[in-house]
Structure formats: C-alpha cells, structure tokens
Interface confidence: low
Amino acid sequence: GCLTQLYENAFFRGGDVASMYTPNAQYCQMRCTFHPRCLLFSFLPASSINDMEKRFGCFLKDSVTGTLPKVHRTGAVSGHSLKQCGHQISACHRDIYKGVDMRGVNFNVSKVSSVEECQKRCTSNIRCQFFSYATQTFHKAEYRNNCLLKYSPGGTPTAIKVLSNVESGFSLKPCALSEIGCHMNIFQHLAFSDVDVARVLTPDAFVCRTICTYHPNCLFFTFYTNVWKIESQRNVCLLKTSESGTPSSSTPQENTISGYSLLTCKRTLPEPCHSKIYPGVDFGGEELNVTFVKGVNVCQETCTKMIRCQFFTYSLLPEDCKEEKCKCFLRLSMDGSPTRIAYGTQGSSGYSLRLCNTGDNSVCTTKTSTRIVGGTNSSWGEWPWQVSLQVKLTAQRHLCGGSLIGHQWVLTAAHCFDGLPLQDVWRIYSGILNLSDITKDTPFSQIKEIIIHQNYKVSEGNHDIALIKLQAPLNYTEFQKPICLPSKGDTSTIYTNCWVTGWGFSKEKGEIQNILQKVNIPLVTNEECQKRYQDYKITQRMVCAGYKEGGKDACKGDSGGPLVCKHNGMWRLVGITSWGEGCARREQPGVYTKVAEYMDWILEKTQSSDGKAQMQSPA
C-alpha cells in the first residue's frame, strides 16, 4: 500500500539503485517515486553532514522485502516511494529554495525582477529543467537579478551549493503550467534525427510518448513498430533531444512513428502510467513471481498491488492453466520496460498501474506548495482542492468555498446552506482560479446529496460542517485534486505553516474577489481564542487562526473553504472556514471547524453502498 511517513534522523542502509543531488527530501521522494526500481530513499540535508560531496545527497534504494535496516544519522530524512499512492503522485515541484545554488549547464542568462519571473522563464523554455536567480542583494553587483536557466543529463542538479542571496527551483512544466503548448499529433512513417538520450522497448507509440514525457531529457521520439524491417529494432522507442528543442530533420520511413513529449502541454499531462492491455503479446523481463489468477485484469491488479512489479504477462497456454485460472507472470527490469516483446503468443501483457494518479479513493493529496483580507493572488494549481459553491437563482453568484476530498465528495460549512437547502440551485466549480473565467459553457458539478451534520443548528457556531456528494465523480488533474484529511483526533501535530484560501471579501464591507486569494495565518490556541470571544463557547471541535494585530483573515464568501497546513511536505485540511467577529479585526481570530474532530462522521457518511470507505486519512 501507500506509505507516506518520513523518518527523521534515519538513513536506510544498502539497496542503492541511484543517487543524485536534490534540494530537499520531498524532491528526493518524488525522484524515487518516478524511478522504476526505487522503493525507499534517504536524503542528507546540508546540515546533516560535513562531507561537501554528500551534502544534499539523495539516495534511491530498492529492496526485495520492501524494507531496509535503518541506521541513526542526525539530520538525515528517509521515507518511501509514493508508488501506489494515487493522486499524491506528481512530478510537479513548486518550491523555491533560498540560499541555495543548483548547478547544471547554464544555457541562458537574462535579467529579471523576481525569482517568480525566473521560474516562469524556465517553465516557458523547452530545455530548462531548473534555474538559479541572484537576488538584488547578491554580493556581486553585475550578477544581481540574473536568471540562469539550466539543464543536466539526469534532470537534477550536478551539484547543490549553499550560497547567500541566490534562490533556485525547478521548471513548472510537470505542473502543466508551461505556456509553450504541446504537439499532440503522432506522425506515421516518419523518423526523427538528432541525439538519442535513451532506448527502451514499448508495445506502441503511445507508451513511448508517455515515457518520453516523463524522461528528464526527452523532447521527441521515434518508435519502430513490430513490423519494422530489422527484427532487432522492432518495438524500439528512441527518446531524443536536440539543441534547438525540435528535430533538425525527419525522414519518411515506413513502420516508424514519431512524436513529441507532452511535458509542455498546458492544463493537462498524460498520467505517468500505461493502463492498456496488449492481447497476443508477451513481455519479457526478470521474474518476480508467478501466480494463478482468473483473468488478465486480475493479473494486472496483482501486479499493481505488488509494489516491485513493473509489468506482467498472463498466459493462456493450456499447460499454464488449471480450471479457470491461468499463470500470471509478474516481472520487472532495470528501466521499467520489457526486455523483450513477442507477438502472436497466447498471452496478454500490460503494465502495473502503481503510478496511475487516479489511483484509489484515498484522500491524501499531493505536495503542492484566501478574497481573504490581507491576502495575495494564488496561481494555477496552487490549491487544487479549492472549489467555488455558487447559487443559480435568477442570477448566479459565488456564496461559499469548499474542499474536494474525494472523486465525488466536497467538504464545506453547514451554514452555507442556511435558507438554501435545495440541491438543484447549487453549482460547484472546481479546477478554477478566476471567477471571471466562468461562462455558461464552463463545466460544473451538480449536487446529488447535501449531508449537514445532525447536531448543527442555524445561527449557532457548533458542528458547522457539511458534506456534498456530487452527481458524478470528478477526474483528478494538476488543477483539480483532493486535499488530505487529518488523522482522527489529531492533536499532537504542531502546524506552523497554515493557509486560508477563498474568493471572499477583501474587507468587511467589500465584495467577492475574482482571483482566488491566499493568506498565511498562524494557528491560535483554543485558550487564547476563548479569551478573545468571551460571549461564545470555543469548543475542542473548533480551531482558531489569526494575527494578534489583525489585518489578515478569512471573510464573507470564504466560508466553507479550507484552512490547510503543510507538515512533512504534505498538505492537510485542518479547518473549515466557519465564523469570526467581523474580518481581520485586532485580537479577533477566525474560527474554523476542526476537521480532525469529525473524522468518524466524515468516514461514516462517505461509506459507499458496498461498505468500502470512499476516502481514508494518511497512514
């Protein structure tokens, strides 16, 4: 299953399959997730080791048993690959690292006014993988505001150095935020020239394209079909690059198919997995296990559940079958692709779905990096769980926020439905940033069921929580995916990085904002909060947040929206925007429904008809 916990001050011994430099443990974990053999990783921050060569070292590891002995190492961080973790699987990494220079091949330099502008330039450059930006206070005046675009053979820095007044980060192309746009079409009977960066075997051009998309240096590819004239080159997928970023030449060649990486697509990237099953095809590789199962789909499920399995062949040969069950060969290789592909067999083959991010119904979400009073504009995909609850009577207007917590579930505040309990009048918009982008053609979700907490009473602040079941399940994308729920009764975690988001008023007597706002707000203890609200009871099922001096807060229109906190690289839904005295007033924190206190209720109400929970909190 999915294991998300990180181990502080621990280092896994042995099992190394690859090593690289990464700026933090979360990026190291992402590289482990996308490495075909990596199950475990260990990361050495700069503070954990004196050996300059090993600082920022990310060590990717494999183990036949799925685990390795842990040794104590002060400062080290270890953890698991997020293979099998559904919608937590993402190559998107938004963080910017201050005081760090990520080294690589510098191929472009320009003057820009901010690190965000530098990241945008990197994202909009086809070859840029990461960047470094020298701030206005950099010690050498001539380098100030320099934006260096970089790449490396492996897509990760060739070295990482601590350097004052330098900020570094990665391209946001894997976040589907590139302005370049992508070539979706595939060209039959055409071979591209230029530099081969890798060679793998694939059953078709679509798998070849997906592998190209997630390979750090592949910009385009050529695939040789299973009827290519040279037998040894059949099913070869050549991953390619060039100086210009496009093929310098192409040659008509029967039985070849060429195309481009889809990494520069805007708004949607292909899933990093291959779900198709190939009848009459055998995939060769290292044998992991052989099991008798009933049907090729069960064979694929078995492969997906066995974390080391990369691909499989289900044999229908009479000698491989008994009764209704046949042999399911679970296999793996060094690069995650078959070592041999044979046609015209009595088998069916396919790949593990361990990297599919539609995944199961579990609710933990990705590590992505509120109007709200004192807030700032959000960017695309920054808060992919945020939804807008709108009412359509004669006109249509935004009334509340909400949080996507599963394919078919939204969590919000009960008071949003005061006087409007009719599900037909509501429209739920997800995957949006600007309310002005909503037109009559914008897709929206309708409500199948509104579940208001049974103890909620109108105009009281208690139990201000409601679940919305959508009429149809939503697909997850980089811009529309769920937020992780906390563990039941989560009281031990100290959250220091919390944000509220929404389109609510920017001042007490204001108006709904167009761009989704975000504000960083510290949590306040319930004792402190109770002092500020003498006339109300602040219960253990509430959580408060705000600055003593005021100035930053949620406001009208933010209700029902999320209070999220980042802990160990993962965002969790800590609170639901509920009530407060005015907005952003001095010594009047915002009051939020404490989600951890309602986990039993949430899980009970979201049980599917077959009794299986539609979501679960993190391990």
Partner: antibody, heavy 120, light 109 residues
Amino acid sequence: EVQLLESGGGLVQPGGSLRLSCAASGFTFSWYTMHWVRQAPGKGLEWVSVIYPSGGPTSYADSVKGRFTISRDNSKNTLYLQMNSLRAEDTATYYCARDGSGSYLGFDYWGQGTLVTVSS
Amino acid sequence: DIQMTQSPSSLSASVGDRVTITCRASQSIATYLNWYQQKPGRAPKLLIYAASSLQSGVPSRFVGGGSGSGTHFTLTISSLQPEDFATYYCQQSYSTRETFGQGTKVEIK
C-alpha cells in the same frame, strides 16, 4: 472549428497546368501532415500525395510522380498542389485532407473538394 | 504498392439489418486500416481508425474488426439506419503511399 477550403480547380487542356490551394483554419496547421486525395467522376478515392509538417519529406502516387508537386506555406496556413502536364485521366475532384492526431489515424478532416477537368 | 480489395462492391439492405463489409490487403498491414463513409457530392468522413477504434462522434453501431494476420478486415453496421446508405471505403496507412479500396455501395432494398 477545423476547416479546409480548396480552390484553383477548373477546365484545362491536356498538357496544361493548374495550381490547387487548400486554406486551413481552426487548428495549428504547421503541426499536421497533409494529403491530397482525388476522385474521378463516378469512381473511388485515390491517394495522390503527402507532405509532412515542416514541409520536408513528400511522397507521390506512381500515377502523378514527376508531374505533380505538393508544397505548403505554414505562415499562410496553406497547402498547394502544382499540377503540370495534365492528362484526361487527371480529371477528378481533388480533396485536401488532414492526417489525424494519433498513431494509425486516418484522415480526420477533409475539404469540400475542387473539380479539375482536363479536356480539349 | 499495397492493394486493397473490398467486397462486395455493392449490397442492398433494409433499415435495421446487420451489414458487414470486408476489406483485404495484399500484404500484412498490422492494424494500419481506416474506414470512411461518403455520401454523393460530399467529402468522405472518417468512421474507424486503427482497424477498430471509433472516431469521435461516430455512432457505436459502426464496428471495425480485423484478423491477427493483418490482411483481413471488416466493417459491421449492427443495425442499419436511413442515414447509413452511402459508399464505404477502406484505406491502409501502413505504407507511406496510402491506398484505398474500390468502395462498397450500400443501397436501400
């Protein structure tokens, strides 16, 4: 909306020349492989020629090789077919067609066709 | 060049009938086969690509099939509708020089 609009057809004497154009709109023309296909009156479809996105490689049916030239101007979103040494058997409706955007796809969009009549 | 042979060259059928058209290639073309529908005075319309994949917007009564040999293909219309009376062409895209079958005319009985 994807649109292909042929023009340039008409009556021409044997041995004469014509230049057909196909104006494309509604998609990124420079990314797509384009074809010419013809259909003689009352007959079936015959593939004539292909040109790849960059304007580079081209290919022709044996029946037109050496007489017809396919070209494209990506800046004008236009496909051309230069037809020289025309013969009576070249009389047909000429269609331009877009190669689909997926492996093994056929021609997913076609123009309405332009009639070429070769007669004395 | 690869020759594509369609059969029958014409057929008569009634609304609601199940109709099957066959296309044979002179050599194996794997699944590089497409089917088109053409009505008089109109441009052809793509129905099926890659032997069995339905082009978007095409009704599901049109079904493409093929043999493992890559030479024998079928187009089946499960329940003929009035708007389905037209000429149908197969086309191979295995070779750079693409070729069409001679067509099958489906007429009202």
